[in-house]
């Protein structure tokens, strides 16, 4: 029995930050779980982890240097990624694992979300065009 995950097909990070919501066909209330976000087609980089426990505060961390935070809904986890670089444009996959109560459950691999990180372009304002060329 697998949990189904829904993600937006694509998100654009205009200000080098993005909220990626992972929606599950499973209620996480009073469960011990590990929700994670993985980068790349092969999910090789674990970007962020949200650990939830019925008796403890939510714990969020990244072992790979990403600036991330997480929020929990009954059937969702939202990852908030900040300080993204243009070269981190990639496909990102949500993963959910329920550790307790037994049996262990995880998800069918989702379709993923392409996060397109737009660089901050410092364009001259039309009101202040800057120095004209001689």
């Amino acid at each position: 029995n697998k949990i189904l995950v829904k993600q937006s097909p694509m998100l654009v990070a205009y200000d080098n930050a993005v909220n990626l919501s992972c929606k599950y066909s499973y209620n996480l209330f009073s469960r011990e779980f590990r929700a994670s976000l993985h980068k790349g087609l092969d999910s090789a980089v674990e970007v962020c982890v949200v650990y939830g426990n019925y008796s403890q505060q939510l714990q969020v961390y990244s072992k790979t240097g990403f600036n991330c935070d997480g929020k929990l809904g009954n059937e969702s986890v939202t990852f908030y990624l900040q300080n993204l670089y243009v070269n981190q444009t990639d496909i990102y996959f949500c993963k959910i694992e329920v550790m307790y109560p037994p049996p262990y459950l995880d998800n069918e691999k989702s379709n993923g979300t392409i996060i397109h990180v737009k660089g901050k372009h410092l364009c001259p304002s039309p009101l202040f065009p800057g120095p004209s060329k001689p």
């Epitope: 011990e32 939830g52 072992k63 240097g65 694992e97 307790y100």
Partner: antibody, heavy 120, light 107 residues
Framework: EVQLVESGGGLVQPGGSLRLSCAAS????????IHWVRQAPGKGLEWVAS????????RYADSVKGRFTISADTSKNTAYLQMNSLRAEDTAVYYC?????????????WGQGTTVTVSS | DIQMTQSPSSLSASVGDRVTITCRAS??????LNWYQQKPGKAPKLLIY???NLYSGVPSRFSGSRSGTDFTLTISSLQPEDFATYYC?????????FGQGTKLEIK
């Protein structure tokens, strides 16, 4: 009380086999990785293998890959290390330890260790 | 694999001394560094996790810090029970690896 208790160590000839056991108690077995870490006489600590009993995912150090097999029985809250094709350099005290599956970075509880001696 | 280089390999000190042990990672492991104490014939015990967090029940004379890929374990005032071997361990990437150990002896 949270406890890990190893057993199964002993003297074995090169090329022989041995199975170590690690009985866990006092915590939710499926919330933790179980690891084997060894220490050769007078040497430092070396991580050997790990298993997450929830989904039976395993990892091995290159030095034991293909020779050692880690497994777990959730009905008995026990992990095992099956050691085949043993070599003199496998001689060590073998410790069973745990790390949290959701917060996996340190080994917070250790067993007392079991001694494996590979010698002819 | 990530290499952990610990220094010094041995150290002589007296009760009441302030002692520092260093561990260097071969690549950036962020805060994912732990310290253990081991006494002869016994299993290691966790002292510090995530570079600077004191594990439950560990005396406050033990502390840890990080500067880039360099990590430090400090014992502010050595007690007789602190003479032991100390190991660092990286918990960022499998295979988890340990430093070679620092043996702290009585001067």
């Amino acid at each position: 009380e949270v406890q890990l208790v190893e057993s199964g160590g002993g003297l074995v000839q090169p090329g022989g086999s041995l199975r170590l056991s690690c009985a866990a108690s006092g915590f939710t077995f499926t919330s933790y990785y179980i690891h084997w870490v060894r220490q050769a006489p007078g040497k430092g600590l070396e991580w050997v293998a790990s298993i997450y009993p929830g989904n039976v995912a395993t990892r091995y150090a290159d030095s034991v890959k293909g020779r050692f097999t880690i497994s777990a029985d959730t009905s008995k809250n026990t992990a095992y290390l099956q050691m085949n094709s043993l070599r003199a350099e496998d001689t060590a005290v073998y410790y069973c330890t745990r790390s949290h599956y959701g917060l996996d970075w340190n080994f917070d509880v250790w067993g007392q260790g079991t001694t494996v001696t590979v010698s002819s | 694999d990530i290499q952990m280089t610990q220094s010094p390999s041995s150290l002589s000190a007296s009760v009441g001394d302030r002692v520092t042990i260093t561990c260097r990672a071969s690549q950036n492991i962020y805060v994912w560094l732990n310290w253990y104490q081991q006494k002869p014939g016994k299993a290691p015990k966790l002292l510090i996790y995530k570079a600077s967090n004191l594990y439950s029940g560990v005396p406050s004379r033990f502390s840890g810090s990080r500067s880039g890929t360099d990590f430090t374990l400090t014992i502010s005032s050595l007690q007789p029970e602190d003479f032991a071997t100390y190991y660092c361990q990286q918990g960022q990437t499998y295979p988890y690896t340990f430093g070679q150990g620092t043996k702290l002896e009585i001067k």
